[in-house]
Interface confidence: low
């Protein structure tokens, strides 16, 4: 159907309440103002239009909804709740829409939502119950299969002196609602660490992207439960070495492909196990591209070409022999 301009009024409970639902069902060929609609493709695109709210009059047929490049700022509870519900909405892209707050229950009443992209929004306030919709210890399972959260870290001054990693993980784990999640992308979020419990509670993951963060170590992270994991992206982090426990867990995953490019590998005596493992394993993609960053004498050496003799640690001098 051709795009038409239309708008709808709400009762006084709109736009920020879970109970806010359209007063009348939308007409079959209705298309919100500033959007393009294709009933044949079951797609609505409201892209780069500076929208400040989710349009109230979305057509009931929508399966793919693009709300990218807007100024939504806040996603309230029930932001997509409609009467009748948007029962077919399966893919929702909200990337780059200046969202900085996603409230509890923002995605409630979307029974078919499988793909959600919130990338490139400065999420200073992601409710722990954004995806689960309730504060119950065990929530109804979310239908989400793919959750894209790349570059959602807010500016430093908006982080409210709390752990951004912790905020994101709380939303991922609340109510165990995301047990069916298969793809999780968390690239470019300045993550310094990965909370140890997060992966254990996402057992269905096939694809995990943690690239372009600031991860220094995976020592306390367990991959053991991720038996379905097919790809693990750790490129462009601050990893210095992978220790035996991590290497063994990765090797034990039957379908895994690991990406480790562009990390500042420290090629000293602690690297010996990893080098041995790299020479034998087939799980690391592009392993021949991995090079040392430190110490200076080892810079740009290819890890696969190192011998145990190359990997030494400077002895720790007793205090009496140390010089300033």
């Amino acid at each position: 159907s051709s795009p038409t301009s239309s708008a709808s009024s709400f009762s006084s409970s709109a736009p920020f309440l879970a109970s806010a639902v359209s007063a009348q069902p939308p007409l079959p060929d209705q298309c919100p103002a500033l959007c393009e609609c294709s009933e044949a493709a079951r797609t609505v695109k409201c892209v780069n239009r500076n929208l400040t709210e989710v349009p109230t009059d979305l057509p009931a047929y929508v399966r793919n909804l693009f709300l990218t490049g807007n100024q939504l700022a806040v996603l309230p509870a029930g932001a997509f709740a409609r009467r009748p519900p948007l029962a077919e909405l399966a893919a929702l892209n909200l990337s780059g829409s200046r969202l900085d707050e996603v409230r509890a229950g923002a995605f409630e009443h979307l029974p078919s939502l499988r793909q959600l992209d919130l990338s490139h929004n400065p999420l200073a306030d992601l409710s722990p119950f954004a995806f689960s919709g309730s504060n119950a210890s065990v929530s109804a399972p979310s239908p989400l299969v793919e959750l894209i959260l790349n570059h959602i870290v807010p500016p430093e001054d908006e982080r409210q002196n709390r752990s951004f990693e912790g905020m994101v993980v709380a939303a991922l784990l609340a109510g165990r609602a995301l047990q069916g999640l298969r793809r999780l992308e968390l690239a470019s979020n300045h993550f310094l660490y990965l909370p140890r419990d997060v992966l254990a509670q996402l057992p269905s993951l096939r694809h995990l992207d943690l690239s372009n963060n600031s991860l220094v170590s995976l020592t306390y992270v367990s991959f053991r439960n991720l038996t379905h994991l097919e790809s693990l992206h750790l490129e462009d982090n601050a990893l210095k070495v992978l220790h035996n426990g991590t290497l063994a867990e990765l090797q034990g995953l039957p379908h895994i492909r690991v990406f480790l490019d562009n990390n500042p590998w420290v090629c000293d005596c602690h690297m010996a196990d990893m080098v041995t493992w790299l020479k034998e394993t087939e799980v690391v993609q592009g392993k021949d591209r991995l090079t040392c960053a430190y110490p200076e004498k080892m810079r740009n050496r290819v890890l696969l070409e190192l011998n145990s003799a190359d990997l030494d640690c400077d002895p720790i001098l007793p205090p009496s022999l140390q010089t300033s």
């Epitope: 009024s9 400040t52 109230t56 200046r98 707050e101 306030d125």
Partner: antibody, heavy 120, light 111 residues
Framework: EVQLVESGGGVVQPGRSLRLSCAAS????????MHWVRQAPGKGLEWVAY????????YYADSVKGRFTISRDNSKNTLYLQMNSLRAEDTAVYFC?????????????WGQGTTVTVSS | DIVMTQSPDSLAVSLGERATINCRAS??????????MHWYQQKPGQPPKLLIY???NLESGVPDRFSGSGSGTDFTLTISSLQAEDVAVYYC?????????FGGGTKVEIK
Amino acid sequence: EVQLVESGGGVVQPGRSLRLSCAASGFTFSNFGMHWVRQAPGKGLEWVAYISSGSSTFYYADSVKGRFTISRDNSKNTLYLQMNSLRAEDTAVYFCARSPAYYRYGLDYWGQGTTVTVSS
Amino acid sequence: DIVMTQSPDSLAVSLGERATINCRASQSVSSSTFSYMHWYQQKPGQPPKLLIYSSSNLESGVPDRFSGSGSGTDFTLTISSLQAEDVAVYYCQHSWEIPYTFGGGTKVEIK
């Protein structure tokens, strides 16, 4: 300099209609949601209506729902309030106000107001 | 609708003294990060002027003797040292949801 200038007020009999305008300048009008707020003589402020930047969404106070219509013409940088079936209790100064993209920033610019008097 | 209750209705304060106005919302208007509460000043014959947004942020150009605090349901506007030009009616307002609602106003006068 941001400026909002209301016009269209006047004296009107109950049951009649009036259309208010708010001319905006000094900012990119099409990027901002806009509100109408009114103030009855000697009383406080009452929010009336809101329209989003691209007219995709609008909301009304219960007291005016079904009688008032908010609209905008981004090509003319103008906000409107069509007021039908006017009542004595609609007598007030009507202000237009700008709403930044982030709701937590409040209504940051207001017009001087235009007076509507509904009287027989 | 969220009801905003302001107190006191009027306030007489000596020049240079502190003035404090309270506002209570009938439900929380704060998320874990932001408060959707604002304060306005209105002088006779003029439109309201935004003083404080998000509970505690001073709008550009507003003197720093004005300050705001609070979260959840209870908020306060403070004028640390009242000046003659501060005589006005002050309103609180939330933007948590539609409809936005205002407090009834507090008239500040010089004692």
